[in-house]
Every structure is written in structure tokens, then in C-alpha cells.
Interface confidence: medium
């Protein structure tokens, strides 16, 4: 692949190693992003389009930063709307939301994964669960994604603004991964509710996506290298 | 249009067992979880279980745990609930309800229900 | 398990008149509470979902607000056919929890 799409095909011409490389969306030369791809986990291939670590970045932020990301992507990040959305659009996805606290780990995987366009409020799109971390975020399937300034919740109050995020809220949130780090009061945190509950906020988080049959080329890759 | 048939409902006796069916039509079944939901005679309702649209996922109220099994063959559009060790409280008219989501959340669709009584 | 608490349990209404049925919740629950009315004989119809959104093909004299532990379903002028039990039900955790019903029948 001498223009790779995302982190599967990066895999695929022999990067091992997670870390920070360029993508070509659609294979163009002209839409080349800089990408964390996480190579280890699960057979690796994963675009990291965010990471909540620290405490250092303000997630507490405006439509326009959502939509084209902000932060470091070897620290904390958002990779932005319109990049998940191009990223998306490119084939069939399947997204993985890695947790941790302390040494207790857990994770949310779904068989697909898209974010719309702008001009659908990158509406969440997402398949069937599996995983550890129970399904928090399936009660967000269709939702419009919501910033303080642009409330495109179903409820009477702002979500991001009584949440202090942005999220792809409903009437507010069995999840909310941009919320306030650190924060243990009501439904303010990091909060996965399945695993953790709304009263504490997951100390490590990452929301990962990669080709959905990144598993069966990968397991091909292996087969012709053995004969 | 959308629609939800229960069956199986009857008189049993206390310690028997019964199963009761609901057949859907008129939608997606697959993508919606489902749930069981009852009604004594003159009294409130009370959820008793649920089950993610995959069926990888089963809930249970206290009061049926261990004894109720709910499950669900989207191939055939349909939902049951196995009662087993059944007690005279738990006499009531069962209803099945169609969630908005594949994950426990608000019933929008409900059955006519089917009557169950257990008594010697 | 959270608690539903509904006030009041029985509510005599002179058609027209204004209809307020309020619930709470044991814990804070967002808004993640819905509305169904049941009349005698039938199954319950779902009114309002997620604190405040009016389920399609619901009267919009029906209306609901609150959030946390604190909801409200208003009728704003009582018909005929509204004499029913209303239940809320928080879905915000399983197992899902009614209220023991509101009764509103003719004054």
C-alpha cells in the first residue's frame, strides 16, 4: 500500500510499532492526515481518534474544535468530526473503546462504526456489541452529536452544557468519554455506565476504529507467509 | 404495522412450570431489544425481563431471578419466557414490550398480554 | 433498585380542568423517565419518553418536564378519553421501575 487509508494497511506493508503515521484518505495524496495508530491491541490496525489520559486538554469545547479535533495524538486528543467522518466513509469500520483503571481493564467493541456529515450533525452510527466493558453505547445510536453551543440533544436542558462535554447525547448519556476528567460527581466524569457507573470518571480511555475486515486480511497476510 | 401476539399464558400450579411465546411482526426484530412486563389483578405493572436485540444480553427483576428465562430466535420473530418454579404471586397478565433500542430502555410497543395464574 | 414515587395516587378531574402528575425518583436518574397510560382492559400506550419528547400520534395536550429525581406529566385540559392510569418509569438503570399509578378519573 504506498499511500495506506488508515492503520490496517499500514499493519498490512509491516509497521508493527504504534505511533503517530500519515494516512491518505481515499488514497489521495492531497487528504493526508497525521494519525496515532495502535498496532498491539487485538490484532492491531487501529486509527486512535481519541485518547482521555491526564487531564492536560479541555475536552469543555465548541462545535467548531470538534469538528476539525485538537490536542496532541501522542497525548490527549480529538481527531475531529469531519476526519472521523472521511475516515468512515471509506469502507465499513468496526469501533473499539478501550478503558482502563489502575490495572482493571475493559472494552466496548462494535461491528460497525460511522460518523455522518455536517450536514447530519455527524449522526452516530454503530453495530453489534461485544466485550467487557457492558453496552453503554448503544443508547446513543443515532444521535446527533452536541457541543455547548450547538444542543442537538433530545432534551429540555443543554447535555453538553449540564455535562460539561460533548457527545453525541440523547437525553443526556449512558457514556460520555468527552467529559470533565476526574470528575466523580453525577454523570460529570468520564463515565462508562455499564462498567463504572455514573459516579466515577475512567482515569485512561481510547476510542479506536479500523476496517472491519482488517481480521480476515491479516489472517490471509499470515496464511501466504507460511507457505 | 407493528404488532406483538403473546400465547401460553393459562392455570398452573404452584412449582410447575410454564413458557409463554409473543410473536412480532412489522418491524426489525434483530434490532430492537425486547422485554416482558406483568400485572397482578388490580395492581401495578412490574417489569420482569429483557433481552438485547442480539440476545447476547439478558436482565432479570429480583423476583424472578433463577426461575424465568427469557430468550429470543430472531429468525423466527419471536420472544419467550420460561418460568419454571412458578408461585402464586406471580399470577398476573403478561405483557410483551417492544423497546426503542437494541439495549434496555423505553417500551413503545406493547402486546395484549396473556393471562397466567397459578393456583392449586 | 431506584424507587418511583407518583403523587397523587388517585386524582378526581372535571373534564377541561388542567392535570398534573408528578414523580420521583429515589436517585438522580437524568432524564431517562417515560409516561405510559393504560385504561382499564388494555395494554399501557407510551405518552412521553425521555422526560419531555411526546411520543408520535400523542395529543399535544400531554407534556412532561423534569430532570434528576423531579418529573412532572401535565394535561393541559382534560378530555374524555384521557380518564386513565398514568405510570412513569425511569429507564435509566435495570431493572426498569414503575410508579404504582395515578388514577384519574371523573370529578
Known amino acids: 500500500f504506498p499511500h495506506p487509508q488508515d492503520c490496517a494497511q499500514h499493519l498490512m506493508n509491516g509497521d508493527t510499532l504504534s505511533g503517530v503515521y500519515p494516512i491518505f484518505l481515499n488514497g489521495e495524496l492531497s487528504q493526508k492526515l497525521q494519525v496515532y495508530c495502535d498496532m498491539t491491541t487485538d490484532g492491531g490496525g487501529w486509527i486512535v481518534f481519541q485518547r482521555r489520559q491526564n487531564g492536560q486538554t479541555d475536552f469543555f469545547r465548541k462545535w467548531a474544535d470538534y469538528r476539525v479535533g485538537f490536542g496532541n495524538v501522542e497525548d490527549e486528543f480529538w481527531l475531529g468530526l469531519d476526519n472521523i467522518h472521511r475516515i468512515t466513509s471509506q469502507g465499513r469500520y468496526e469501533l473499539r473503546v478501550d478503558m482502563r483503571d489502575g490495572q482493571e481493564a475493559a472494552f466496548a467493541s462494535y461491528d460497525r462504526f460511522s460518523v455522518e456529515d455536517s450536514r447530519n450533525l455527524y449522526k452516530l452510527r454503530i453495530g453489534s456489541y461485544n466485550g467487557t466493558a457492558g453496552d453503554s453505547l448503544s443508547y446513543h445510536q443515532g444521535r446527533p452529536f452536541s457541543t455547548e453551543d450547538r444542543d442537538n440533544d433530545v432534551a429540555v436542558t443543554n447535555c453538553a452544557m449540564s455535562y460539561k462535554g460533548a457527545w453525541w447525547y440523547k437525553n443526556c448519556h449512558r457514556t460520555n468519554l468527552n467529559g470533565k476528567y476526574g470528575e466523580s460527581r453525577h454523570s460529570q466524569g468520564i463515565n462508562w455506565y455499564h462498567w463504572k457507573g455514573h459516579e466515577f470518571s475512567i482515569p485512561f480511555v481510547e476510542m479506536k476504529m479500523r476496517p472491519y475486515n482488517h481480521r480476515l486480511m491479516a489472517g490471509r497476510k499470515r496464511q501466504s507467509l507460511q507457505f | 404495522q407493528v404488532q406483538l401476539v403473546e400465547s401460553g399464558g393459562g392455570l398452573v400450579q404452584p412449582g410447575r412450570s410454564l413458557r409463554l411465546s409473543c410473536a412480532a411482526s412489522g418491524f426489525t426484530f434483530d434490532d430492537y431489544a425486547m422485554h416482558w412486563v406483568r400485572q397482578a389483578p388490580g395492581k401495578g405493572l412490574e417489569w420482569v425481563s429483557g433481552i438485547s436485540g442480539s440476545g447476547g444480553s439478558t436482565y432479570y427483576a429480583d423476583s424472578v431471578k433463577g426461575r424465568f428465562t427469557i430468550s429470543r430466535d430472531n429468525a423466527k420473530n419471536s420472544l419467550y419466557l420460561q418460568m419454571n418454579s412458578l408461585r402464586a404471586e406471580d399470577t398476573a397478565l403478561y405483557y410483551c414490550a417492544k423497546d426503542i433500542s437494541a439495549v434496555p430502555d423505553t417500551f413503545d410497543i406493547w402486546g395484549q398480554g396473556t393471562m397466567v395464574t397459578v393456583s392449586s | 433498585d431506584i424507587q418511583m414515587t407518583q403523587s397523587p395516587a388517585s386524582l378526581p378531574t372535571p373534564v377541561g380542568d388542567r392535570v398534573t402528575i408528578t414523580c420521583r425518583a429515589s436517585?438522580?436518574?437524568?432524564?431517562?423517565l417515560n409516561w405510559y397510560q393504560q385504561k382499564p382492559g388494555k395494554a399501557p400506550k407510551l405518552l412521553i419518553y425521555d422526560a419531555s419528547n411526546l411520543e408520535t400520534g400523542v395529543p399535544s395536550r400531554f407534556s412532561g418536564s423534569g430532570s434528576g429525581t423531579d418529573f412532572t406529566l401535565t394535561i393541559s385540559s382534560l378530555q374524555p378519553e384521557d380518564f386513565a392510569t398514568y405510570y412513569c418509569?425511569?429507564?435509566?438503570?435495570?431493572?426498569?421501575?414503575f410508579g404504582q399509578g395515578t388514577k384519574v378519573d371523573i370529578k
Open positions: 418509569q425511569q429507564s435509566y438503570s435495570t431493572p426498569q421501575t
Open positions: 436517585q438522580y436518574i437524568q432524564g431517562f
